[in-house]
């Protein structure tokens, strides 16, 4: 489970995004493909610094549907 306001790097960052975004998906492409400006951003913000749940959610592919 996600622990707020911590450094997330590598596979832990990928897995946490999968958990947070669920079926929505997120702004990562496949390994070895060209790194996008967006994906560089999340590593900068969550691995090189610490990030919280709200910031992680901004990288989900589409907004969560409101009930």
């Amino acid at each position: 489970a996600y622990r707020p306001s911590e450094t997330l790097c590598g596979g832990e960052l990928v897995d946490t995004l999968q958990f947070v975004c669920g079926d929505r998906g997120f702004y990562f492409s496949r390994p070895a493909s060209r790194v996008s400006r967006r994906s560089r951003g999340i590593v900068e913000e969550c691995c090189f610094r610490s990030c919280d749940l709200a910031l992680l959610e901004t990288y989900c592919a589409t907004p969560a549907k409101s009930e």
């Epitope: 790097c9 590598g10 596979g11 960052l13 897995d15 390994p31 070895a32 790194v35 560089r40």
Partner: antibody
């Protein structure tokens, strides 16, 4: 072809600093993070940290925090690793290595290594 | 900090042998495990990433498996050029850490 070419061997005295360079070619320099890894004689591999060549941001292993500085020059597609306050146990081969993606899938291209010897 | 432990070391084998090297993580790292080959005086070479994905250009006799804490690198039929030291590396969290290495020697 994709390659990383590092600077030559260095001999330093304890307390001094060393700056190792790593010049990238054959790919878009700013699209891949760069790691630094070292290997003491007859020992295993030790991760030192990583730099984003695009913005220059860095993340260092706690062990080296305060002693290591990683920088880059986008005009020459070169990254640098400077280690200060050298000790005899810093004697090692220092490698730069390209990150595959997001620190999650390994290091796919390595420099040839730079031998740093620290001796009085 | 995640500790990586490799075994056996060293490993004696002959050309044509099936060789298995194991790597254990001190906590679960999902499938974020990479394998490298290093020959004396040379830089490491990435063989396997994400536990089981073969890096481009690496011969198919190399394979990887495992998830969680236990992983294996298998060489199905050892070739003369495969005598080297092999390292596992976790890429689940920083600091990235490597196993101590397994040297594959000629029997």
């Amino acid at each position: 072809q994709v390659q990383l070419v590092q600077s030559g061997a260095e001999v330093k005295k304890p307390g001094a600093s060393v700056k190792v360079s790593c010049k990238a070619s054959g790919y878009t320099f700013t699209s891949y993070y760069m790691h630094w890894v070292r290997q003491a004689p007859g020992q295993g591999l030790e991760w030192m940290g990583i730099i984003n060549p695009s913005g220059g941001s860095t993340s260092y292993a706690q062990k080296f925090q305060g002693r290591v500085t990683m920088t880059r020059d986008t005009s020459t597609s070169t990254v640098y690793m400077e280690l200060s306050r050298l000790r005899s146990d810093d004697t090692a081969v220092y490698y730069c290595a390209r990150d595959v993606q997001w620190l999650a899938y390994g290091m796919d291209v390595w420099g040839q290594g730079t031998t740093v010897t620290v001796s009085s | 900090r995640i500790q990586m432990t490799q075994s056996p070391s060293p490993l004696s084998a002959s050309v044509g042998d099936r060789v298995t090297i194991t790597c254990r993580a001190s906590q679960s790292i999902s499938s974020y495990l990479n394998w490298y080959q290093q020959k004396p005086g040379k830089a490491p070479k990435l063989l396997i990433y994400a536990a089981s994905s073969l890096q481009s250009g690496v011969p198919s006799r190399f394979s990887g498996s495992g998830s969680g804490t236990d992983f294996t690198l298998t060489i199905s039929s050892l070739q003369p050029e495969d005598f080297a030291t092999y390292y596992c590396q976790q890429s689940y969290s920083t600091p990235l850490t490597f196993g101590g290495g397994t040297k594959v020697e000629i029997k």
